[in-house]
Interface confidence: low
């Protein structure tokens, strides 16, 4: 080549990423790389992740002479070592009056009576543990249940015989069953009294309730 096309190794500099070129011979050069880079022209970023300290499931993301940790949602901080307080971030994390309890790497809900599930959104099926008498129908409620009794049965658990079945109340009186003991209660029409509403009452008296 002519003198007008002389090769000068460091002009222009072949070193990239801030590397400094040093001519070592007529046609040779050496690149002094900035921290975080390697290769004959400093073209390669050194992977800092083999020595990473990302914790708790954090994923290492290489940087220039450094690395960052991409943390799972439950963790934060430079190395994913700081617990995220989900209870602060999500005030409504627990439903139906449940209390949020922050934990290392997550959170939990302390549910009020009658609710269950991770976020207290599931109504506990109280009928699963109910003792309604066979033949009756259990109805689940929040933290309780009720028993729908078949004809002839009464009481909270339908475990009592319905005393109204024998029509003990006379004169068109209304018959109710005491859910605690199964006894009938007659609500007498005007002018009658007594357990069965069979007695006349004095003028001026109105409805009477009689328990039996």
């Amino acid at each position: 080549a002519g003198s007008d096309s002389l090769y000068v190794p460091c002009a222009p500099s072949p070193c990239v990423n801030g590397g400094t070129c040093r001519q070592t011979g007529d046609f040779t050069f050496e690149c002094n790389c900035l921290p975080g880079f390697e290769g004959s022209t400093c073209e390669r970023n050194i992977d800092d992740c083999p020595n990473h300290r990302c914790q708790n499931g954090g994923v290492c993301v290489d940087g220039v002479n450094t690395y960052n940790c991409r943390c799972p949602p439950q963790w934060t901080g430079q190395f994913c070592t700081e617990d995220v307080d989900e209870c602060l971030l999500q005030p409504n994390a627990c439903q139906n009056g449940g209390t949020c309890a922050n934990r290392n790497g997550g959170y939990g809900c302390v549910c009020v009576n009658g609710w269950s599930g991770d976020d207290c959104s599931e109504n506990i099926d109280d009928c699963a543990f109910a003792s309604c008498t066979p033949g009756s129908t259990c109805i689940d409620r929040v933290a309780s249940f009720s028993c729908m009794c078949p004809e002839g049965k009464a009481g909270l658990l339908c475990h009592l015989d319905d005393a109204c079945i024998s029509n003990p109340c006379h004169k068109g009186a209304l018959c109710d069953t005491n859910p605690l003991n199964g006894q009938y209660i007659c609500t007498c029409p005007q002018g009658y009294k007594g357990a069965d509403c069979t007695e006349d009452v004095d003028e001026g008296n109105s409805h009477h309730h009689h328990h039996h």
């Epitope: 020595n51 300290r53 990302c54 708790n56 499931g57 954090g58 290492c60 430079q78 190395f79 070592t81």
Partner: antibody, heavy 120, light 107 residues
């Protein structure tokens, strides 16, 4: 209760091999980084090997002093950490500890240690 | 590798004394430092992690402080059971490295 119990130490000739075991219990083994640290008599602590957790593919790091001679591994089904030591030198004589990396820059559980003596 | 310079190498103190041990690192370790206590024939016990956080079950007379490259372990009122060797350790980058240790002896 977190427990780590090392075994397998003993007397071995220079150039020989030895395999140390560390049986762990009381925590989910695959969730934690595990480390081997050694201590020569009357000297300080020297970290020699680590195995990251399952989330980090159980990848491995060694100190320059044992690289290519020692191998760290674990059997999660047996909840046991191992250190296979080959081409042993007299300067490898030490008490070897396995420890659990608690995830916040601290080694929060240690075994009782097992003595390895390399001598002819 | 990150170099750990711990001082003093030994200290003589009496029960009730305040004892301070320092650890200097060769580069910023962003509070990634732990302190351990070791008694003869026993394995090390974690006292402080993350430069200043007290490990569960460790008495509150132990405290840690510092940032960047300079860290300190303080025992506010030395108790008979505290006579032991103490080590600092950086957990910021592999290889993990330890300080040379500080032996706390009875005066």
């Amino acid at each position: 209760e977190v427990q780590l119990v090392e075994s397998g130490g003993g007397l071995v000739q220079p150039g020989g091999s030895l395999k140390l075991s560390c049986a762990v219990s009381g925590f989910t083994f695959s969730d934690f980084y595990m480390e081997w640290i050694r201590q020569a008599s009357g000297k300080g602590l020297e970290w020699i090997a680590a195995q990251r957790n399952k989330a980090n593919d159980f990848s491995i790091v060694y100190s320059a002093s044992v690289k290519d001679r020692f191998t760290i591994s674990r059997d999660t089904s047996k909840s046991t950490l191992y250190l296979q030591m080959n081409s042993l030198k007299t300067e490898d004589t030490a008490v070897y500890y396995c420890s659990r990396d608690g995830g916040k820059w601290g080694l929060d559980a240690w075994g009782q240690g097992t003595l390895v003596t390399v001598s002819s | 590798d990150i170099q750990m310079t711990q001082s003093p190498s030994s200290v003589s103190a009496s029960v009730g004394d305040r004892v301070t041990i320092t650890c200097q690192t060769s580069e910023d370790i962003y509070s990634g430092l732990a302190w351990y206590q070791q008694k003869p024939g026993k394995s090390p016990k974690l006292l402080i992690y993350g430069a200043s956080r007290l490990q569960d079950g460790v008495p509150s007379r132990f405290s840690g402080s510092g940032s960047g490259t300079d860290y300190t372990l303080t025992i506010s009122s030395l108790q008979p059971e505290d006579f032991a060797t103490y080590y600092c350790q950086q957990g910021f980058k592999y290889p993990l490295t330890f300080g040379g240790g500080t032996k706390v002896e009875i005066k």
